[in-house]
Every structure is written in C-alpha cells, then in structure tokens.
C-alpha cells in the first residue's frame, strides 16, 4: 500500500480552482475522481474518455501538458458541496491508478481577525465625539440603477425593488490559474459546450435593471454569506 502525495487546494465560493496533477509517461486514460464518504471508492469526476460526472457538467475541464508532465483540472462555479477529497490518477481502473490525493476546501473569502488587523484611522481632525450627537437616520426608499459604460452613462427610471425571487444562473468565473506555457492544451470538454455556454449567457442576460441587481446580489451574497462556519464572517 503506497502512500499518495497529498495537496490541499482552497477555493472561493462561486469562483474556480485549478488542480495540478502528474501526467504519466505512457499514453493512458487520466482522470480526477472524488472519494465517496463511507464506501471508500473513488468516483470519476472527469476523464480523458470524455466522461464528466453529472454535477460537474459545464464547469470542469481537463487539459494535458505532456511537456510539463502534468495535467490540469479546472473546476468553476464552486459550491460548498464541492468540498471534499479528490484524487488524480491514470489507468482504466479509477480506484487503482491514483497518483495524488487532493483535498478541496471551498469557502467564502477569509475574514481577517479583529485582533490581528489594525483598524484604519479616520483623519485626526474629524472628531468622533461630534459624530456621536446623531439622531436615528431614516433613509429614502427610492433607488435608481445605472449601467455605466465607457461610452455613455445612461440613467434609467427608478425601479421598485423587492427581495430576489428569480432563479439565478451564474456565469462561469474566469479561472485565476495562470496557464502553463509551451504547450497547446488538449481539452476534453465536449467541443459544443463552450458555444452552448456562450449562447446560454446571451439568453440569460438580465433584461431589466431590477433583475440585473437581484441576480448579481444573489451571487454576491453567495460569496459573502454562503459557507461561513463559526466566526468566519465573510464580506
């Protein structure tokens, strides 16, 4: 029983991660699998035989870099449920050819500790005791959304806002991993997927400022409030 090298990968909720795996010399099926709690088996997530596990469809890609002796698996639109133990491997039997263990932890951005981070000071001459004489502030209920482009700044009429009830579809976030130079990657995501995603994005583009605000609000909340545990308040 050989001990596998282990790597830990941190991912941000809604973001993406790239898992780096060793690539064997011989031309053989390679894969990323996920260890199933309880059963001890490792279920294929993605492999070079064009298999993609259902819950990862449209958000996982596998690219090989033979000259670098590695392959990369990118997972986008991360959710809490993606946290877990994965393994890279090679060979026809997913359970047998593991080369590296990968622990993925998906979380909201880490909130700096209260004690550790010095609080930035406001200008010394802006005296806070003066600030303290304030009555309760009542805000206006009227708000306006504006889309600003380099060419123009157009105003739209005020929109009535209520809590978001729209079904949200996230656009896949661009990967932060830098690509590996020197190789043209071989991608094993079915070729139609990219065009389908782009067509879908066209269809799903928010039609109104209100929808746009709520769609984005949902995503921001997922980033900031989505997977906090204990005291890791994100924001």
């Amino acid at each position: 029983l050989r001990i596998l090298p282990e790597v830990k990968v941190e991912g941000e909720l809604g973001g993406s991660v790239t898992i780096k795996c060793p690539l064997p010399e011989m031309h053989v099926r390679i894969y990323l699998c996920r260890e199933m709690a309880g059963s001890g088996t490792c279920g294929t997530v993605v492999s070079t035989t064009n298999f993609i596990k259902a819950e990862y469809k449209g958000r996982v890609t596998l690219k090989q870099y033979p000259r670098k002796n590695l392959f990369l698996v990118e997972v986008t639109q991360l959710t809490e449920s993606d946290s877990g133990v994965y393994a890279c491997g090679a060979g026809m039997n997913t359970d047998r050819g593991k080369t590296q263990k990968v622990t993925l932890n998906v979380h909201s951005e880490y909130e700096p500790s209260w004690e550790e981070q010095p609080m930035p000071e406001t200008p010394k001459w802006f005296h806070l005791p003066y600030l303290f004489q304030m009555p309760a502030y009542a805000s206006s209920s009227k708000f306006v959304t504006r889309v600003t482009t380099p060419a123009q700044r157009g105003k739209v009429p005020p929109v009535h806002h209520s809590s978001p009830t729209t079904q949200i579809t996230h656009r896949p976030r661009v990967s932060r991993a830098s690509s590996v130079a020197g190789d043209k990657p071989r991608t094993f995501l079915p070729s139609t997927t990219a065009s389908k995603i782009s067509a879908l994005e066209g269809l799903l583009k928010p039609q109104t400022p209100s929808y746009n605000h709520h769609t984005r609000l949902h995503r921001q909340r997922a980033l900031d409030y989505g997977s906090q545990s204990g005291r890791e308040g994100q924001g």
Partner: antibody, heavy 114, light 111 residues
C-alpha cells in the same frame, strides 16, 4: 490581507467637484461590489451606492443619483466616486467598503469651504 | 421605506456590567432566500466602522464571545455580557435585505 486605501482629506471649493479614490488589494477586485458610504456629524452613516467592478454596473441611493458618480479602473484595482456641485452639505467623511461591509477604507474627509 | 431605529441613543455602562442595544426595522428583514440580513458594526473613536455580527447572530472572526446578536423579523438586539474598555464607540445596526440602510447609532460610553 484585504485592504481598501483612501486618501486622508480633500479641501474643495463650493460649486466644484471632487473625485475620491479607493484602491483595493488583497483580493480579486472584480469579484466583489464596492459600496460608498457618507458619514456626517449628526446624520450617521448613509449609503450612497455600489459599483460592480466586473462591468461597472452601478446602483444608487436616489438621494445621491445627481450628486455621485461611481466608476472603476480595473487595471489599477481602484474605485472612484466623483461628487459634483459641492456645497457645505457635502462636507463629510466618505468611506468605500466591500460588499457586506466587512472591509472598510479609512475614509476621506471632504471639506467644502470657500 | 426600510427605517432602522436604534435605542438608546447613548448607553453609559460600568466596566464588567452587561449592555443591550435594540434595533427595530420598519419592515421584516427576512429575505425570500430564508436569511435575515441584519448586521452590527462598531465604530471606535477615530476609526473606520468594523463589522461585528452578520446574519443576526454570527460573530465575525476575532470578535469576543461576550458579544451576542439575536432577534428576527423586525426586532433585533445586540448584547454585551461584560463590557470592557475596548468596547466603547458607536454601534450601528444595518440591514442588507432591502438594499442597505443603517440605524442611527448608539454611543456606548464607559461610566
């Protein structure tokens, strides 16, 4: 760590405009909305609006729609707020803060005075 | 209008004693996603505000457990079990369910 850097103070003339900056670091700038908040003596904290740095979509409190203009420069990870037609009522500390107000800049004191 | 009303305006407390601040909203802050976006900030003298509590009762990293947040719907409370000198400043509640609104602030001063 996440930081939002703002200049300490701006002294401006009535009727003019001022552009305040907020330089973000320690996180992916385009992933998180940035809010702007006004703090005046007596009035407390007042939400001005937010900008989504990924594509500059903005959302304003109606009270500030003709006063404030929010923009970003992605290349320098900096957000800006321009305040126009300044009066003494605009004298305040202006903060930028990230989406759920867990991270704040140190604030810029704007003083409107002849 | 979502108006956030905080009471009292000023709170004078002896070190080691408990303190309680109330925050009432003019409409329910329970969102359609099942979460209540009611949060608390502390602005210490000469500093920027700092978030203490989010989603009614969750403490931010590093916030001492003498702070507790509670409430639902429209009525919320921030409690400090034993006030310490570093707790002085102005406490604000704010809501993020219906855009963003801040309460008027409660100044905590040490007797």
């Amino acid at each position: 760590q996440v930081q939002l850097q703002q200049p300490g103070a701006e002294l401006v003339r009535p009727g003019s405009s001022v552009k305040l900056s907020c330089k973000a670091s320690g996180y992916t700038f385009t992933n998180h909305w940035l809010h702007w908040v006004k703090q005046r003596p007596i009035q407390g904290l007042e939400w001005i609006g937010y900008i989504d740095p990924s594509d500059s979509l903005t959302h304003y409190n109606q009270n500030f729609k003709d006063k404030a203009t929010l923009t970003v420069d992605k290349s320098s990870s900096t957000a800006y707020m321009q305040l126009s037609s300044l009066t003494s009522e605009d004298s305040a500390v202006y903060y930028c803060a990230r989406f759920s107000f867990a991270y704040w800049g140190q604030g810029t004191l704007v003083t409107v005075s002849a | 209008d979502v108006v956030m009303t905080q009471t009292p305006l000023t709170l004078s407390v002896t070190i080691g004693q408990p303190a309680s601040i109330s925050c009432k909203s003019s409409q329910s802050l329970l969102d359609s996603d099942g979460k209540t976006y009611l949060n608390w900030l502390l602005q210490r003298p000469g500093q920027s505000p700092k978030r203490l509590i989010y989603l009614v009762s969750k403490l931010d990293s590093g916030v001492p457990d003498r702070f507790t947040g509670s409430g639902s719907g429209t009525d919320f409370t921030l409690k400090i079990s034993r006030v310490e000198a570093e707790d002085l400043g102005v406490y604000y509640c704010w809501q993020g369910t219906h855009l963003w609104t801040f309460g008027g602030g409660t100044k905590l001063e040490i007797k």
